[in-house]
């Protein structure tokens, strides 16, 4: 009696159980009563990652440098290429199909948390007593210079974008 179901790593065709092709190989011809399933390895730029009966291998993913992508792991006949973002960029989606540059914090803002491969820079306004005069993805707000510790006085007040300017103390004439 012809089978109605087949074992694992087999498939049913023409009332017969044929072996599936192993990962990295595609189907050329189904088995017959007298011959085993015929499979062929995928070419260098292709892959199949499961036991299968596919007649075509899948093309490896292309990591497009125009989208900020680079190869993280080269594909094999059994695995797809894995792309990742270039340094200074992060993924725009879960599947990481494109990348965007890490945000820079503008003058008056400092970096609260640097970016990761999946999340952007977090910026914060510089509070009173701190400043940032650069646009940066790494720089935190810096404290104003303490003129007193240098035996100087504040000549120009600091802002969130500029440091204080220190100057010599006016010496009173006798």
């Amino acid at each position: 009696e012809p089978p109605t179901a087949c074992r694992e790593k087999q498939y049913l065709i023409n009332s017969q159980c044929c072996s599936l092709c192993q990962p990295g190989q595609k189907l050329v011809s189904d088995c017959t009563e007298f011959t085993e399933t015929e499979c062929l390895p995928c070419s260098e730029s292709e892959f199949l990652d499961t036991w299968n009966r596919e007649t075509r291998c899948h093309q490896h993913k292309y990591c497009d440098p125009n989208l900020g992508l680079q190869v993280q792991q080269k594909g094999t006949s059994e695995t797809d290429t894995i792309c990742t973002c270039e340094e200074g960029l992060h993924c725009t989606s879960e599947s990481c199909e494109s990348c965007v540059p890490h945000r820079s914090c503008l003058p008056g803002f400092g970096v609260k948390q640097i970016a990761t491969g999946v999340s952007d820079t977090i910026c914060e306004p510089c509070p009173v007593g701190f400043f940032s005069n650069v646009s940066s993805a790494f720089e935190k707000c810096r404290p104003w210079t303490s003129c007193e510790t240098k035996d100087l006085v504040v000549q120009q007040a600091g802002t969130n974008k500029t440091d204080v300017v220190c100057g010599p103390q006016d010496r009173q004439r006798a």
Epitope: Q72, I82, K112, Q113, T116, G117, V118, I122, E124
Partner: antibody, heavy 115, light 107 residues
Framework: QVQLVESGGGVVQPGRSLRLSCAAS????????MHWVRQAPGKGLEWVAV????????YYADSVKGRFTISRDNSKNTLYLQMNSLRAEDTAVYYC????????WGQGTLVTVSS | DIQLTQSPSFLSASVGDRVTITCRAS??????LAWYQQKPGKAPKLLIY???TLQSGVPSRFSGSGSGTEFTLTISSLQPEDFATYYC?????????FGGGTKVEIK
């Protein structure tokens, strides 16, 4: 001081639902992406879900996709995790954590799924 | 998914010892790696981020190094309060993943 406090854990039967909350204080909640991480008894850490600072992007671990929903209310400084179709393997302490580099963390809330 | 393999999984050491924990990633993750310390019944605490940057308030005896696929956490001189479990975590791609943990116990 900077603080995250989870609540809403408890004992629930398989197939039922539960909603966890995470109340933030001492920092600007609305600029941070927020995460849920869980830890089964005696086991390691497992990342569960993330939501972007404005709620526009959400990603989930495969083990909870389609069952759990992460959300936030920036006006209330609160993060949520709606857990549906709960399974025994969801039993864990659930932590919320803030920011790109998971700092700070809450103290955790225990969810036990058992019949 | 990116797998993180921590070694050793268990470590017995004495106060004052230099301790090194390794974390290997199954794919390159640049420097997007964090280290956490967890004590029993407590939440994890961030020690190191971006592979080598010490989190504010963390003692300087903790240091991190590495990039790509191989990373290390070093405690230069183990203190009584350092006996805990340590986890690495990659933040390069979703889903974010943690290593299996390294338990540091008193010899």
């Amino acid at each position: 001081q900077v603080q995250l406090v989870e609540s809403g854990g408890g004992v629930v039967q398989p197939g039922r639902s539960l909603r966890l909350s995470c109340a933030a204080s001492g920092f600007t909640f609305s600029i941070y992406g927020m995460h849920w991480v869980r830890q089964a008894p005696g086991k390691g850490l497992e990342w569960v879900a993330v939501i972007s600072y404005d709620g526009s992007n959400k990603y989930y671990a495969d083990s909870v996709k389609g069952r759990f929903t992460i959300s936030r209310d920036n006006s209330k400084n609160t993060l949520y995790l709606q857990m549906n179709s709960l399974r025994a393997e969801d039993t864990a302490v659930y932590y919320c954590a803030a920011g790109n580099w998971f700092d700070p963390w809450g103290q955790g809330t225990l969810v036990t799924v058992s019949s | 998914d990116i797998q993180l393999t921590q070694s050793p999984s268990f470590l017995s050491a004495s106060v004052g010892d230099r301790v090194t924990i390794t974390c290997r990633a199954s794919q390159g993750i640049s420097s997007y790696l964090a280290w956490y310390q967890q004590k029993p019944g407590k939440a994890p605490k961030l020690l190191i981020y971006a592979a080598s940057t010490l989190q504010s308030g963390v003692p300087s005896r903790f240091s991190g190094s590495g990039s790509g696929t191989e990373f290390t956490l070093t405690i230069s001189s183990l203190q009584p309060e350092d006996f805990a479990t340590y986890y690495c975590q990659q933040l390069n791609r979703y889903p974010l993943t943690f290593g299996g943990g390294t338990k540091v116990e008193i010899k």
